[in-house]
Interface confidence: low
């Protein structure tokens, strides 16, 4: 696995100082030329001897992180991440300070890279014995041990084949994506392949680990295999999605399809610096690779996304929860799972596509035809979430070319909106992941215009809270999305509801576990609502027989969602009236022992209505959907009694799940109503019509 072995070098301090003095001015200059450490080293050593070493900032504790998958760890190389506002000069000084303090203890270290542009920090080769010391350095936020990342494709068949023509009914403009530049972080590529010749610029960026062992002698066609195929899928002349997109390739994976987190970080930094030096149109970055969960890789992706770059990544081929992998688990990245021609999740050997709440959508990823590096006119079929991600990168390039001003949030919502819904056979996924995994397969929009009028919303699931009595789970929307409603779900039914609360100047959705519960999920409904002003109105438990009620009382504010939260362990069987009084659509109704929260929003032309579907008899699932032209913003259940497992939105349908009460024989407790709040924006519709 190409681990960097780091051996302790026993250099006692007096001997080290003596060596530096013996080197004299000429020797000192040579030393500085090599690693730039000579003067700083001596000064730091002296200041430490005098007790003048700078202490870490008071009250902050830096943390150490490493890959949970042991075989993928690369001990001996560490990414030291510094606090957000740390300047480059401070990063360099901190790195040198580490070297000096290490030398004093008899260890040699090597600074491999100093990060700036995306994240402040440095990459250091050192003994793990020095971690405790490094964590105490000033400015240090956290340290992460380097780890491996892998290409996420499998070459199924290697025969040379002619690519099929796209179906006539598929929207395929010949120059789609022409305003967009797609960066590919992958293996080397065969840039003279006729599929991609003249479309891909090979940058001089290369940061790859040595190949493992000597069994794999570098062979160009093998080394280029993965990257060439993906470049062809994105923008190939015959088999590409966005035939007009131009691409730039960075080599971060070696001939075995293996790279490192640190190499990928340096690649992302390279892209950010290129973007600053020469700003172009919209940028898409394709990361067809996966490694174990990495805080630093996710953080770098977040920074790049917030700089206006669209990142698309492979969910991973491990038939596992994508949240356990990076960059798939980064919320700012568009994470793509793989399906086959029958819209089934792709099986890859004994494994298959990843799944779960960190996947945004699926795309074709089995037997995908693309450029083969075996010759300049060869084609090959490959499978994996890399291929699926390449499809979505191509679709993103098409959309951005048609609407260059789209933000990441707008692009993600459009990708979701135009996807084929509910076509994947969910039985393939583990039972506990089915509800969390989006049943969406990416598709090109029917035309590149005409989406402007739509109110776009998506469902965001939190991580699981864990089972402790006071455990909570939090779901968040993207920075430029509005949280329009909040719901919760527990498989055991033991929960204490949910509420919207302000966190860092933004509303978040928090769900509460109950005593004896196995844990809860918070479910946020996140929407694109320009110029919106939203607030939460709360009514404490009423204790009255009619239950607790709250409404939107501000002029021009409409109800977009209802939440309820209770402190008692069991709400019992009290049943408030299922149908709310006529003429009061802006009202949330709930259990008398619960506090009720109404999400109330004012936005130009926003109108909403409440839609209910009640079932008098016990049923495990009750649904209600919004009509064409309306978008589901809120989904909740009436009543909030303990047999209701929770409510959540699936596309434009509100789903309320209940425990199977048929065995109890209590039909009064079995009655459940699904309450949907459906909204539309007349303002967006008018603006769209004016454009057309």
């Amino acid at each position: 696995m190409g681990t960097v072995s780091s051996r302790r070098s026993w250099w006692p301090l007096p001997l080290l100082l003596l060596l530096l003095l013996l080197l004299g001015p000429a020797g000192a200059r040579a030393q500085e030329d090599e690693d730039g450490d000579y003067e700083e080293l001596v000064l730091a050593l002296r200041s430490e001897e005098d007790g003048l070493a700078e202490a870490p900032e008071h009250g902050t504790t830096a943390t150490f992180h490493r890959c949970a998958k042991d075989p993928w760890r690369l001990p001996g190389t560490y990414v030291v991440v510094l606090k957000e506002e740390t300047h480059l000069s401070q990063s360099e000084r901190t790195a040198r300070r580490l070297q000096a303090q290490a030398a004093r203890r008899g260890y040699l270290t090597k600074i491999l890279h100093v990060f700036h542009g995306l994240l402040p920090g440095f990459l250091v080769k050192m003994s793990g014995d020095l971690l405790e010391l490094a964590l105490k350095l000033p400015h240090v936020d956290y340290i992460e041990e380097d780890s491996s990342v892998f290409a996420q494709s499998i070459p199924w068949n290697l025969e040379r084949i002619t690519p099929p023509r796209y179906r006539a009914d598929e929207y395929q403009p010949p120059d789609g994506g022409s305003l967009v530049e797609v960066y590919l972080l992958d293996t080397s590529i065969q840039s003279d392949h006729r599929e991609i010749e003249g479309r891909v610029m090979v940058t001089d960026f290369e940061n790859v680990p040595e190949e493992d062992g000597t069994r794999f002698h570098r062979q160009a066609s093998k080394c280029d295999s993965h990257g060439t195929h993906l470049a062809g899928v994105v923008s190939g002349r015959d088999a590409g999605v966005a035939k007009g997109a131009s691409m730039r390739s960075l080599r971060v994976l070696n001939c075995q399809g293996k790279g490192t987190v640190s190499g990928t970080l340096i690649g992302l930094e390279f892209i950010r610096k290129s973007q600053l030096v020469q700003p172009v149109g919209p940028l898409v970055v394709l990361l067809p690779l996966a490694g174990g969960y990495s805080r630093v890789l996710n953080a770098a992706c977040q920074r790049l996304a917030r700089a206006g770059v669209v990142l698309v990544t492979a969910a991973g081929n491990f038939r596992d929860d994508a949240c356990l992998y990076s960059p798939a688990s980064a919320p700012e990245v568009i994470t793509v799972g793989a399906t086959n021609a029958q819209d089934q999740p792709v099986t890859l050997g004994t494994l298959g596509t990843n799944f779960g709440r960190c996947v945004d959508l699926f795309a074709p990823g089995e037997d995908i035809i693309g450029a083969s590096s075996d010759c300049s006119t060869c084609f090959v079929s490959q499978s994996g979430t890399s291929q699926a991600a390449a499809h979505v990168a191509g679709i993103a390039a098409m959309m951005l070319s048609a609407e260059p001003e789209l933000t990441l949030a707008e692009l993600r919502q459009r990708l979701i909106h135009f996807s084929a819904k509910d076509v994947i056979n969910e039985a393939w996924f583990p039972e506990d992941q089915r509800v969390l995994t989006p049943n969406l397969v990416a598709a090109l929009p029917p035309s590149t215009h005409g989406a402007g009028w739509q109110l776009f919303c998506r469902t965001v699931w939190s991580a699981h809270s864990g089972p402790t009595r006071m455990a909570t789970a939090v779901a968040r929307c993207a920075p430029d999305e509005e949280l329009l409603s909040c719901s919760s779900f527990s498989r055991s039914g033991k929960r204490r509801g949910e509420r919207m609360e302000a966190q860092g100047g933004k509303l978040v959705c928090r769900a509460h576990n109950a005593f004896g519960g196995e844990g809860v999920y918070a479910i946020a409904r996140c929407c694109l609502l320009p110029q919106a002003n939203c607030s939460v109105h709360t009514a404490p438990p009423a204790e009255a027989s009619m239950g607790t009620r709250v409404h939107c009382h501000q002029q021009g504010h409409v109800l977009t969602g209802c939440s309820s939260h209770w402190e008692v362990e069991d709400l019992g069987t009290h049943k408030p009236p299922v149908l709310r009084p006529r003429g009061q659509p802006n009202q949330c109704v709930g259990h008398r022992e619960a506090s009720i929260h109404a999400s109330c929003c004012h936005a130009p032309g926003l109108e909403c209505k409440v839609k209910e579907h009640g079932i008098p008899a016990p049923q495990e699932q009750v649904t209600v959907a919004c009509e064409e032209g309306w978008t589901l913003t809120g989904c909740s259940a009436l009543p909030g009694t303990s047999h209701v497992l929770g409510a959540y939105a699936v596309d434009n349908t509100c789903v309320v799940r209940s425990r199977d009460v048929s065995t109890t024989g209590s039909t009064s407790e079995g009655a459940v109503t699904a309450v949907a709040i459906c909204c539309r924006s007349r303002h967006l519709a008018q603006a769209s019509q004016e454009l057309q």
Epitope: T3, W156, F216, H217, H226
Partner: antibody, heavy 123, light 111 residues
Framework: EVQLVESGGGLVQPGRSLRLSCAAS????????MNWVRQAPGKGLEWVSG????????SYADSVQGRFTISRDNGKNSLYLQMNSLRAEDTALYFC????????????????WGQGTMVTVSS | QSELTQPRSVSGSPGQSVTISCTGT?????????VHWYQQHPGKAPKLLIS???ERSSGVPDRFSGSKSGNTASLTISGLQAEDEADYYC???????????FGTGTDVTVL
């Protein structure tokens, strides 16, 4: 059903040759690296040779280097082991084994095995 | 041919845990190469149990778990059952050989 079936084993005199075959079915043979592994009677497993999916990479154990030749025919879904200058210590049950795909994070693992073919070298 | 070293045999009563070690060198296990574990019942072909140190193959019960530290990998069988009686082999890639290397094998007996 994914299956590997070895054939070609038998009794042979020292110094003579033998050719083993392995027929693959139930998977895309041309996508996988393949290996031969042997097991002497009452002994442990010994890796003999490996070949990548397109025959670009071939490697042998020191004990058979220069005497054995591994090859494959993707069109026929078949793997071969040509064994020359056979010795008594080559007596073993020879297994054909499929290796995890090239781009897997866990390459070198043998996920599918045949039932083996017995080679006895004796005068 | 250098081999990975395993104990010749280990035994345990039903329900107990047993651990099999697999010691290599910096050229194989210690060099960061993956370690895989196989189970072989008498007269049968080996079966891949754990790949990449920790990933169980499909259908393998979670009683089987793997770990690695330095030049040594380990396979632990917790809650030993009668059907676990078999030979177990570790395997890794060896950089100096440009090929795979197997462990000497461990005979697990359920008392």
């Amino acid at each position: 059903e994914v299956q590997l079936v070895e054939s070609g084993g038998g009794l042979v005199q020292p110094g003579r040759s033998l050719r083993l075959s392995c027929a693959a079915s139930g998977f895309t043979f041309s996508s996988y690296s393949m290996n031969w592994v042997r097991q002497a009677p009452g002994k442990g497993l010994e890796w003999v040779s490996g070949i990548s999916s397109s025959s670009s990479y071939i490697s042998y154990a020191d004990s058979v280097q220069g005497r054995f030749t591994i090859s494959r025919d993707n069109g026929k879904n078949s793997l071969y082991l040509q064994m020359n200058s056979l010795r008594a210590e080559d007596t073993a049950l020879y297994f054909c084994a499929r290796e995890y795909d090239f781009w897997s994070a866990y390459y070198d693992a043998f996920d599918v095995w045949g039932q083996g073919t017995m080679v006895t070298v004796s005068s | 041919q250098s081999e990975l070293t395993q104990p010749r045999s280990v035994s345990g009563s039903p329900g107990q845990s047993v651990t099999i070690s697999c010691t290599g060198t910096s050229r194989n296990i210690g060099g960061g190469n993956d370690v895989h574990w196989y189970q072989q019942h008498p007269g049968k072909a080996p079966k891949l149990l754990i790949s990449g140190v920790i990933e169980r193959s499909s259908g393998v019960p979670d009683r089987f778990s793997g770990s690695k530290s330095g030049n040594t990998a380990s396979l632990t069988i917790s809650g030993l059952q009668a059907e676990d009686e078999a030979d177990y082999y570790c395997q890794s890639f060896d950089g100096s050989l440009s090929g795979s290397v197997f462990g000497t094998g461990t005979d697990v007996t359920v008392l």
